[in-house]
Structure formats: C-alpha cells, structure tokens
C-alpha cells in the first residue's frame, strides 16, 4: 500500500480583497485514519485556519463533501479575504492519536497573496492661507494597497508636477502598504481657481487611477490694491471720494475711512463683483462735507483683508476758499496718495 | 438539543415494501451524514446504510444492497429508508443515527418496530 | 467483526475496563455505546476513540491501542448497568461494525 501524501498543487494563489480564495489539497490516500487541518505559517506559532474533526471557522468552507466516505479532496475556500490572509498556508493529515492527534504529513504550502486597491487618496494643504509667489506644501496619502509597487503622480490644472518626494511604508514586507507624499506648490495671483491633483495607479485599479484634489482656493490669499480718488462735486461743499478694492481673495474684507487719522465709517465687504481669475472687487465711496473743514483734509481708506494687517492709501483733499469753483479742480485737488501698512 | 425521530414502522407480510421516515432537528441537518441501524429482537447493533451529507454519496452493508435504499431531503430535514423484499430477518427496531466527522455515531433516535410476519 | 467479552461485573465504585479487539489501529477509529435496556435508544458514551460528548459523565473514558479500544468506567454506579457496544468505522471498506454487546452488572 503506498505511503499517503498530501499534494498541495499550487504553489501559489493570487486573489483580490473581497473576493474568495480557493486552496486546493488532496490526500492520495484514506489510511492512516484521522484529520486534515489547515494553517497559515509553519512552525508553534502557526494559526488554525479549518479543522476537519471539530471547530467553528465561519469564513471557511469545503470544497467538497467531506462527509462522503471516500473522500479525498480536502480543498477549502475563504471567503471575504483581507490583506491580512496573506502568507502561506499548509493542507497538513493527522493521525489519530491519544490524547492528541499526531501530525502525520503536510502539504508543500500554498502562497496567497492578496492584491488591495489603494484608498482613495487625500489631499491636504497647508493650515494657513499664502499669498502669491509663496511655495506651499500639500500632502497626498492612500493607504492599504498590495503589492506593494505604486505610482503617484502631483498635477497643477492638469501639468505635471516635478518637485515631490514620495515614500511608501512599510520598507520590508506587510500585508498591505501606505504612501505619502509632499507636493511644493508655488503660487500666482490667477491660482484662485487652480486645483492640486495627487493620482494614484496600482495594478488592483486596472489602468483607471484614483485621484485627490485639493482647491486652491482653500489655500491661497490674494491682497487687495487700492486706489482712491476724488469724483466731481455732487452738491455744493460736498465732495464724494472711491476707495477703488481690486483683485483680493478671499471675500473678508473690512474697510474703515479715516478723515485727519480719525475713523469716520467702517464697513463690511457684502455686494462684492467677481473677476473672472475668480478674486473680487468692491468700492466704498465717501461723502465728505467741505465746509466742515478749515485745514485741507487727509482722507485714508484703510482695508484689513481676512484678518491680516491693514493696508491703506491716502488722498489730500484741499479745502478751498471758494467752494463753488470745486469742479474746475483748483478747490479740491488730487495732491497724490501714498500706500502705507498700518500696524 | 438534537432529537431524531424515527416513524413508518409496522406490520408487513414478507416480500412487502416499507418507507422509514426520521425527522431531524436541534442541528443542521444538511451538515451531517446520516445512518441507520437496527437491532433485531434479542440481538446485537446491525449498521445497514449511510448517506453523506449532500445526498450523493450512499454505503451499505452487503445483505441489504439491492433491496435497501437510503434518501433524504435536506430542505425538509428528513432521513428515508425505502425497504423492499422484506423477510422476517429484517423484523427489528430501526434507528436513525447522525454521523461524526469520521463516520461514528453520535446522536440515536428512539427507533422505529418494524415486523415482517405472514 | 469486532470482539467483545459478553459480560463483566463489578461492585459500586470499583473501575470496570471493557476491550474491543479486531479493528486495525491505523484504519479503525472506535466508539462505545450504551444501551439500557433492548430496544431502547442507544446512547453514545464515547466516540473516536477517546472523545466523551459533553453530557456523559467523566468517569466514562476510552482509549485505542495497536488493534485494541478500551472502555473505561472509573467509580461505576449502579446506573451503569447497561449493554455497552463497541463500534467501529474501517477507512478501508467504509463499514460500520458493531461488537456484540458486554452486559455489564453493578453488584
């Protein structure tokens, strides 16, 4: 009578998360009596994945009937595999024994591997806004792929990034793997639309890559130029000056005029026009009554855009001996204006 | 708890037929492989036949083959024994027996009188 | 067809051993049953070999050796009493077989 073997066909198995894995073993023989049982690794500290004899191992089944009598076929199937089933697993015969069954011959071992899709990958950028001509570091992470090889890619509107470093973790082997990456983003003043896209290929995704953004509008801040100028008269002693608010990102925006350094009205920006870069314009006007002045006036629109230091410009408003002739701008005329921070 | 319920015994004349029933339940039925056996009057424990767990594989003793057959349903959790050519050896208690993994018995039913008598 | 002493006897308390011989130990795994009374539903003490199913009381134990099973009732009561079978299943033939009964009496 021949000796019995364990024959494990296949020398390794390749399946995708999710799905099920089939390990196939057969016994050449019934005799010596006694059960077949399934580990993962070798050795005392290898894990029971099926006992034949007794046991409950709610993700594993049968291939086969192995009530039949005759049955020699003691493949199983896994269901629901994780990157955490990966390793090699043994189809091992017992021989009855007292008290303890006795291990009689193992299969060669069969690998399984398991293949993960990458998570979806996150894009996060810096905690604090950056005004143009500034480099900002975004961040791109996915996690729980296998293999291990990966490809990640850094697109500004579409072009190809150059300048990022990329590491992938675990160095040595894992059961399933993360990457990271830092992406340098220099900034410009139209970027207010602009998106920061990290894409991931991985051999699970089957040529279709997964893809991260992050909107550089969440990023960038765009300050405020200003102009103030002076309008023609509206009514007698009265003159009506702009302060002219250009291209700032983002929308908060508080604007305060002062007349001689003392504050006159502060407002808020509310009904603001969008360029289309996508930053905004707003104008404040100022109705200053002449005849209230004895000295030239000093009349200072002061911004303070999204919580930064004020900016200003100033406008010198003469005050004329005849206020009539205010329109032929010899009264009331522009001196000049000159941009100062405020701190 | 398992409990296994022989019925269709009775009273035949020989070269008559009878179907044996036995109602399982207290497990899943369709995860084990069944048996019976009998015990003819003032006698020992006889294994007739055995069925696996599907259904497709079937085993007897030699002296029944050909006029014994061994069923079952699983969706109605039932074990059958269909008798033909009955003679007054086969007047016996019979039992339905559930299988271990390795083809031993573990659970009995209370049993099932058959009597084959002219 | 496997051998079994027709009966055996023993006092309260006492260790009773039953043997069963004619399987192959390599091919034969063996079982024991209980049977109080003829006709009545025999009850499973031991099977393969050496497992007890958890409502049998432990001072029932079994044990196979060569081509030999024993049955073993350390401190036997008087509701022991019984006919104890021994059945095996041969790998080889996929048969079950049964010995013929040991009547056992508690004195």
């Known amino acids: 009578e021949e000796e019995l073997q364990v024959i494990q066909p296949d020398k390794s198995v390749l399946v995708a998360a999710g799905e099920t894995a089939t390990l196939r073993c057969t016994a050449t023989s019934l005799i010596p009596v006694g059960p077949i049982q399934w580990f993962r690794g070798a050795g005392p500290g290898r894990e029971l994945i099926y006992n034949q004899k007794e046991g409950h191992f709610p993700r594993v089944t049968t291939v086969s009937d192995l009530t039949k009598r005759n049955n020699m076929d003691f493949s199983i199937r896994i269901g629901n595999i994780t990157p955490a089933d990966a390793g090699t697993y043994y189809c091992v015969k017992f021989r009855k024994g007292s008290p303890d069954d006795v291990e009689f011959k193992s299969g060669a071992g069969t690998e399984l591997s398991v293949r993960a899709k990458p998570s979806a990958p996150v894009v996060s950028g810096p905690a604090a806004r950056a005004t143009p001509q500034h480099t900002v570091s975004f961040t791109c992470e996915s996690h729980g792929f296998s293999p291990r090889d990966i490809t990640l890619k850094w697109f500004k509107n579409g072009n190809e990034l150059s300048d990022f470093q990329t590491n992938v973790d675990p160095v040595g082997e894992s059961v399933s793997y993360s990457i990271h990456s830092t992406a340098k983003v220099v900034l410009t003043r139209e970027d207010v639309h602009s998106q920061v896209i990290c894409e991931v290929a991985h051999v699970t995704l089957q040529g279709d890559p997964l893809r991260g953004t992050a909107n550089l509008s969440e990023t960038i801040r765009v300050p405020p130029t200003l102009e103030v100028t002076q309008q023609p008269v509206r009514a007698e002693n009265q003159v009506n000056v702009t302060c002219q608010v250009r291209k700032f990102y983002p929308q908060r925006l508080q604007l305060t005029w002062l007349e001689n350094g003392n504050v006159s009205r502060t407002e808020t920006a509310s009904t603001v026009t969008e360029n289309k870069d996508g930053t905004y314009n707003w104008m404040s006007w100022l109705l200053v009554n002449v005849s209230a002045h004895r000295d030239d006036v000093k009349l200072t629109c002061q911004v303070e855009h999204d919580g930064q230091p004020a900016v200003s410009k100033s406008h010198d408003l003469k005050v004329s001996a005849h206020p009539k002739e205010q329109g032929s701008n010899t009264a009331a005329e522009n001196t000049g204006s000159n941009e100062r921070n405020i701190y | 708890d398992v409990q296994l319920v022989e019925s269709g015994g009775g009273v035949v004349r020989p070269g008559e037929s009878l179907r044996l029933s036995c109602a399982a339940s207290?497990?899943?039925?369709?995860?084990?492989?069944m048996s019976w056996v009998r015990q003819a009057p003032g006698k020992g424990l006889e294994w007739l036949a055995g069925?696996?767990?599907?259904?497709?594989?079937?085993y007897y003793i030699d002296s029944v083959k050909g006029r014994f057959t061994i069923s079952r349903d699983n969706p109605k959790n039932s074990l059958y024994l269909q008798m033909s050519s009955l003679t007054a050896e086969d007047t016996a208690v019979y039992y339905c027996?559930?299988?271990?993994?390795?083809?031993?018995?573990?659970?009995w039913g209370l049993g099932t009188l058959v009597t084959v008598s002219s | 067809a496997l051998t079994q002493p027709a009966s055996v006897s023993a006092n309260p308390g006492e260790t009773v051993k039953i043997t069963c011989s004619g399987g192959?130990?390599?091919?034969?795994?063996y079982a024991w049953y209980q049977q109080k009374s003829p006709g009545s539903a025999p009850v499973t003490v031991i099977?393969?070999?050496?497992k007890r199913p958890s409502d049998i009381p432990s001072r029932f134990s079994g044990s196979a050796s060569g081509s030999a099973a024993t049955l073993i009732i350390t401190g036997v009561r008087v509701e022991d009493e019984a006919v104890y079978y021994c059945?095996?299943?041969?790998?080889?033939?996929?048969?079950?077989?049964f010995g013929a009964g040991t009547t056992l009496t508690v004195l």
């Open positions: 027996a559930r299988e271990t993994w390795n083809h031993l018995f573990d659970y």
């Open positions: 207290g497990f899943t039925f369709s995860s084990y492989a």
């Open positions: 069925i696996s767990a599907g259904g497709s594989d079937t």
């Open positions: 192959d130990y390599y091919s034969t795994y």
């Open positions: 099977h393969s070999d050496d």
């Open positions: 059945g095996g299943y041969d790998g080889r033939t996929y048969i079950n077989t």
